[in-house]
Interface confidence: low
């Protein structure tokens, strides 16, 4: 029977530790059923619409680059973007829109309107999230687009503002 | 030892392709452990409190009839619904309710007030989502009730309105 | 090889049920592969801004005690919790905050601002939530802060405030 | 379990002030509205007005230039003063916490005016 | 301000009977309704608050249902201790006003 000697290719994991051929439970417990996720928080500083993330966060089987989480194994995933929005009202209302993209498409958006009454207050805090369920193929992308980014408020709450992926079902 | 001419009934899936009876990392890969989860867009025409939904969404181990989604594998599930409101303020606030179901009981709402300041916006862009964990059986149903549907956004947005569902753990 | 009558500890869960060594199928349906989840609703009288939950809820492989969810296996875990507000409004307008906090350091936290016109409605309905994914080590413990909590709105929507945590990979 | 309780002389002459206090007791003042509502003989109830903690009040339009509420967070009690009063202001006076509708009570003061 | 009227302002019911009290609002109130149960020389008891929830402690036969402006009070099954004063109130807007009130009397 298939040893820990099985050579290290994507598909074929070596079963870690130990030589445990013979142990089924053993054999089970380690067993490659391959998960991915990532859970990155946004940059400190936006200039655009798309949003950039901070690369120093969670990522195992996903890659990150230029504002993309970029899949890595193929399957139904599960995506997630919270943020926090900081308003200065203006005299009218403000919409704030999320936008979560696929490929640069547009999946799915979440909008709220605030500053509803005007001047009647300072500042107004939001919070806006969105989810995904979808099927991702290899080298799929996933971003996100805020038109408000300006209002996105990185300084009090750094940690507020999250993009994160996981793998529900992989598509062996 | 078993082969892949298990014979193909719920709980004896036949391990796909090839025969690698030999072979356990082969077997562990093709392993049916049992997911099911479905994700459903609000049909674009809604005319009660009971949200109707796009039934050629996602669907896998799920059945949806007449509004609910019906589960066929029992376990503990993450159920989530998430909807975009459109209100057009009349002069007095307005409070957005969303009922997850199980079986027809209400097991969890949300509820906001929009239009607070009465008439100083046209509209006001509402996003509202609910969660539930909770364990289900074969044939439970899980839908969804808002008051008022007629403000929920399926023009602008016919993408942003959903039901879903995954099985978490299974009570094999 | 390995058998039912594997010691029962934590790491050598018996395979349930009948003897089944030699049918690889059967073995892999019972595989001890860990899950832990919670979900618990919010205690009816709440007096201090720590929240306490009632421990009738659902609880497997995590633990309750003075406020915490007490984690018992490593892993990485997905935390959420989802709180409704009922707010008289007074003359300003008030800020609603939910922190989670990991081992007493707030990891995460959403705000969201109310009664921004005023006396114009008596009572404001808010539904906030916050997630996180995160590692978790053995006896972490997880709890959430609410500084304005008196308006956690626990006699009419007692089910609608939880906190819920489900481990996504364990770090075997 | 909350309690309330009004204090408060029982008989004010026509045109002086009508002095309550209430005392909460078993749970803080903090985060709720509080209520004076009033009953006069043989008939039904009215709302005075309300404070929050923060001190922010609001009262009955057809009592609003007589009414005072305050409150004292550090002793856990809100008072009423109701100034220029006349027989038609004898009343049984209730306070009460406003969390939705009054959940709480006090056992009520009568307070009579005459002279 | 928003006029608070209950119907009957007197009932007669024994023992056993089911009785419903109807409070009617000058307008819309959403559900910001609630009931207190009254007796002779003691402050008002909240039963019933936002239209049909039952506060704590108060015993089942007690119901509350209605939308909007129109509202009802039900006893299932009147006990010895149910004969009192009964009230509605609305604090949907300022300032908050009660209903005149219903004497329920043993028949």
């Known amino acids: 029977q298939r040893t820990d000697s099985i050579p290290n290719s994507p598909d074929n994991i070596p079963l870690r530790g130990g030589n445990c051929s013979e142990d089924l439970l053993c054999i089970l417990k380690r067993a490659p059923f391959k998960k991915s996720w990532a859970y990155l928080q946004v940059a400190k500083h936006l200039n655009k619409t798309k949003l950039s993330w901070n690369k120093d966060g969670i990522l195992h089987g996903v890659r990150y680059q230029d504002g993309n989480l970029v899949i890595q194994f193929p399957g139904l995933y599960f995506i997630i973007c919270q943020l926090q929005f900081l308003v200065q009202c203006p005299n009218n209302s403000v919409d704030l829109k999320l936008e979560l993209l696929i490929n640069k498409h547009i999946k799915k958006q979440a909008l709220v309107t605030v500053c509803e009454s005007g001047m009647q207050t300072k500042h107004v805090y939001q919070n806006l999230s969105q989810f995904l369920l979808d099927y991702l193929q290899v080298n799929t992308t996933v971003s996100v687009n805020v038109d408000t980014f300006q209002y996105i408020d990185t300084s009090t709450f750094p940690l507020e503002n999250v993009l994160s992926v996981f793998l529900y079902s992989n598509s062996d | 030892q078993r082969t892949d001419s298990i014979p193909n009934s719920p709980d004896n899936i036949p391990l796909r392709g090839g025969n690698c009876s030999e072979d356990l990392l082969c077997i562990l890969k093709r392993a049916p452990f049992k997911k099911s989860w479905a994700y459903l867009q609000v049909a674009k025409h809604l005319n009660k409190t009971k949200l109707s939904w796009n039934k050629d969404g996602i669907l896998h181990g799920v059945r949806y009839q007449d509004g609910n989604l019906v589960i066929q594998f029992p376990g503990l599930y993450f159920i989530i619904c998430q909807l975009q409101f459109l209100v057009q303020c009349p002069n007095n606030s307005v409070d957005l309710k969303l009922e997850l179901l199980i079986n027809k009981h209400i097991k969890k709402q949300a509820l906001v007030t929009v239009c607070e300041s009465g008439m100083q916006t046209k509209h006001v862009y509402q996003n509202l989502s609910q969660f539930l964990l909770d364990y289900l059986q074969v044939n439970t149903t899980v839908s969804v009730n808002v008051d008022t549907f007629q403000y929920i956004d399926t023009s602008t947005f016919p993408l942003e309105n959903v039901l879903s569902v995954f099985l978490y753990s299974n009570s094999d | 090889q390995r058998t039912d009558s594997i010691p029962n500890s934590p790491d050598n869960i018996p395979l349930r049920g009948g003897n089944c060594s030699e049918d690889l199928l059967c073995i892999l349906k019972r595989a001890p592969f860990k899950k832990s989840w919670a979900y618990l609703q919010v205690a009816k009288h709440l007096n201090k801004t720590k929240l306490s939950w009632n421990k009738d809820g659902i609880l497997h492989g995590v633990r309750y005690q003075d406020g915490n969810l007490v984690i018992q296996f490593p892993g990485l875990y997905f935390i959420i919790c989802q709180l409704q507000f009922l707010v008289q409004c007074p003359n300003n307008s008030v800020d609603l905050k939910l922190e989670l906090l990991i081992n007493k350091h707030i990891k995460k936290q959403a705000l969201v601002t109310v009664c921004e016109s005023g006396m114009q409605t008596k009572h404001v309905y808010q539904n906030l939530s916050q997630f996180l994914l995160d590692y978790l080590q053995v006896n972490t413990t997880v709890s959430v802060n609410v500084d304005t909590f008196q308006y956690i709105d626990t006699s009419t929507f007692p089910l609608e405030n939880v906190l819920s945590v489900f481990l996504y990979s364990n770090s075997d | 379990q909350v309690q309330l309780q009004e204090s408060g002389p029982g008989l004010v002459k026509p045109s002086e002030t009508l002095s309550l206090t209430c005392t909460v007791s078993g749970g803080s003042i903090s985060g709720y509205y509080w209520s004076w509502i009033r009953q006069p003989p043989v008939k039904g109830l009215e709302w005075i007005g309300y404070i929050f903690y923060s001190g922010y009040t609001k009262y009955n339009p057809s009592l609003k230039s007589r009414v005072t509420i305050s409150v004292d967070t550090s002793k856990n009690q809100f008072s009423l003063k109701l100034s220029s009063v006349t027989a038609a202001d004898t009343a049984v006076y209730y306070c009460?916490?406003?969390?939705?509708?009054?959940?709480?009570w006090g056992q009520g003061a009568l307070v009579t005016v005459s002279s | 301000a928003i006029q608070m009227t209950q119907s009957p302002s007197y009932l007669s019911a024994s023992v056993g009977d089911r009785v419903t009290i109807a409070c009617r609002a000058s307008?819309?109130?959403?559900?910001?309704l609630g009931w207190y149960q009254q007796k002779p020389g003691k402050a008002p008891k909240l039963l019933i608050y936002a239209e049909s929830s039952l506060q704590s402690g108060v015993p089942s036969r007690f119901s509350g249902s209605g939308s909007g402006t129109d509202f009802t009070l039900t006893i299932s099954s009147l006990q010895p201790e149910d004969f009192a004063t009964y009230y509605c109130?609305?604090?949907?807007?300022?300032?908050?006003?009660f209903g005149q009130g219903t004497k329920l009397e043993i028949k």
């Open positions: 109130l609305q604090d949907f807007n300022y300032p908050y006003t």
């Open positions: 307008q819309g109130i959403r559900n910001n």
């Open positions: 009460a916490r406003d969390r939705w509708d009054f959940d709480y």
